[in-house]
Interface confidence: low
Amino acid sequence: NWVNVISDLKKIEDLIQSMHIDATLYTESDVHPSCKVTAMKCFLLELQVISLESGDASIHDTVENLIILANNSLSSNGNVTESGCKECEELEEKNIKEFLQSFVHIVQMFINTS
Amino acid sequence: ITCPPPMSVEHADIWVKSYSLYSRERYICNSGFKRKAGTSSLTECVLNKATNVAHWTTPSLKCIRDPALVHQRPAPPSTVTTAGVTPQPESLSPSGKE
């Protein structure tokens, strides 16, 4: 599933090339392994901002598909509880390009540990 | 055709650079507040073709207390479990796209 998440992220990267979305999004660029689920949830939440601001149906659907895939993968790991992690709103806001790059990195972290 | 002043959003301000049709502007959360993750600060001046009246789209923005400031008070650590993230329900006919 995480591999499919990466391919959806690549699709989103391609789709937004032609759009002017100047949003800045909460981005965890240095994910601590003990906070990776919390960080992933922030990425998934902020991905919805891209969906909202793009106004493009294909982006809406790719985002929704990605969220379903990621949730399935997270739940298959069982209920992991993480404490003392940063809330999304405490993270630094970065542009969409940097956000998506960091998103790919955290997904790769999940791939490497699954 | 131009848009009227945009609606107010709690704990946020907006400085409109242009009221022209298709202008895109952003609200900014007030000091001590942060944009809630997953919400958008964007508003766009669009035309309702049925009435020929321009209006600003409704932003999904929610401004919440800055957790960094809240955490300055003693509080239990935040805990997260792997319950799913649900996509925000999207209107089937968004008000901003008439």
Partner: antibody, heavy 117, light 106 residues
Amino acid sequence: EVKLKESGPSLVQPSQSLSITCTVSGFSLTTYAVHWVRQSPGKGLEWLGVIWGAGSTDYNAAFMSRLSITKDNSKSQVFFKMNSLQADDTAIYFCAKNGAYYVMDYWGQGTSVTVSS
Amino acid sequence: EIVLTQSPAIMSASPGEKVTITCSASSSVSYMHWFQQRPGTSPKLWIYSTSNLASGVPARFSGSGSGTSYSLTISRMEAEDAATYYCQQRSSYPLTFGAGTKLEIK
């Protein structure tokens, strides 16, 4: 108010092509995708394809070799072309607006097409 | 492709009766949409993403389900509910529809 209206021939000769235009109002084709669906007594509702806001298309594999969907955003028109029609292509052809999540939230009235010599 | 099987194909219900229409998918899908169609008209979106009522749909309608099993329920049948109902999956291409359930009023 969102509206879609299909226009095209009601009768097509076997082996000929079918061209239908879907004219829309109340929304922008640069933002919203448009699906094509047909309905016949024998096969029920069949999804044929979709053209996205950005211009890319997805087709039902069963029709891909003979189907083309294009559009003119400035004229608010979507063009459907299917080649090599046979009698079993006789159906009502609909265009439908795509909301989020592949929701066909508004449909045209449909145009009835008979394939016969 | 994902095949959607609706049951029953035809049914009739008395006013006030509870009605349930089911849609079974040949493989698991994320969500199901439902359309209502009356004779001579185009399909109308009725329920989207499994359980959300489209604009103007009476609250006596509800949708539920997951995986391969979905259903549309009318808590109390009314004459205006007589129509054909179709399910549609949006999880994989090609998008597919069920063959329909024709609901008649007794």
